[in-house]
Interface confidence: low
């Protein structure tokens, strides 16, 4: 399965926020998207394997790390109102 946490988050601007994504399928490929009205899903960052991270189309202000197969935490380095969104994590073989 693949799980994200927290389900909901309210934070002050300027705070660092980390969203967790964990998958138990041993998938190599993991992705973070944000969903906004009028834009659909936009790719933020993705990883093809351990220690591999790549920028998507809207990566500014975000970072990810991949220290193991199962996890790809997404960090909002300094939360901004423009980062208010619905975030989705995905994985694939």
């Amino acid at each position: 399965e693949i799980t994200q946490s927290p389900r909901h988050k309210i934070t002050e601007t300027g705070r660092q926020v980390t969203l967790a994504c964990h998958q138990t399928w041993n998938h190599n490929n993991m992705f973070w998207y944000r969903q906004d009205l009028g834009h659909g899903l936009r790719l933020i960052h993705y990883s093809y394997g351990v220690h591999d991270t790549n920028k998507g189309e809207v990566s500014d202000g975000y970072s990810v790390s991949r220290s193991n197969t199962e996890d790809l935490p997404l960090t909002l380095e300094s939360a901004a109102s423009s980062q208010t969104s619905v975030y989705f994590c995905a994985s694939s073989e």
Partner: antibody, heavy 117, light 107 residues
Framework: EVQLVESGGDLVKPGGSLKLSCAVS????????MSWVRQTPDKRLEWVAL????????YYTDSVKGRFTISRDNAKNTLYLQMSSLKSEDTAIYYC??????????WGQGTTLTVSS | QIVLTQSPSIMSASPGEKVTMTCSVS?????MHWYQQKSGTSPKRWIY???KLASGVPARFSGSGSGTSYSLTISSMEAEDAATYYC??????????FGGGTKLEIK
Amino acid sequence: EVQLVESGGDLVKPGGSLKLSCAVSGFTFRSYGMSWVRQTPDKRLEWVALISSGGSYTYYTDSVKGRFTISRDNAKNTLYLQMSSLKSEDTAIYYCSRHGGNFFDYWGQGTTLTVSS
Amino acid sequence: QIVLTQSPSIMSASPGEKVTMTCSVSSSVSYMHWYQQKSGTSPKRWIYDTSKLASGVPARFSGSGSGTSYSLTISSMEAEDAATYYCQQWSSNPQYTFGGGTKLEIK
């Protein structure tokens, strides 16, 4: 079946250079981080270098920084280790290994580097 | 940098005997990995994430531990278990560190 086959080991004089190769088969090479790990004559294991799956990131143990370069050719399913300014303490069996997370889940049979005058 | 210290460095056990070897860590870590190496061959992943057995590893092997102390146990020694066992840990940068090994011989 996962296979990693190293080649290129040789006897080299101190200060010399050498390039090791590791031909990979049996898995999707471009999806995995890869490392070189060496085993010294006293049987100790030492991680040498890591390259991320796409080749964007490389990491080295302190003793080889600036002397060794890890690279990969995902089209050829091959991992490389370019070594220069070789020292006697680089003498070892060099293994290429696949990452299964923060560990090494498959290892090659090894190739031997001897640095001696 | 994290230092892994394995003990004993050499040990022997009789068939059927319970065997325990340890890996001490210089600072607390979350998990440990173990490899088996027989003479003239490359290391094999044996136990990962402290207690998970790699494919093909007999159920008589187990791993445990937390913090700064980890162990590998064989519930009943068999001749084919004679080998050198290495513990391994990862730390950020990244750096991968191995213990010096425990050589297990059969009596």
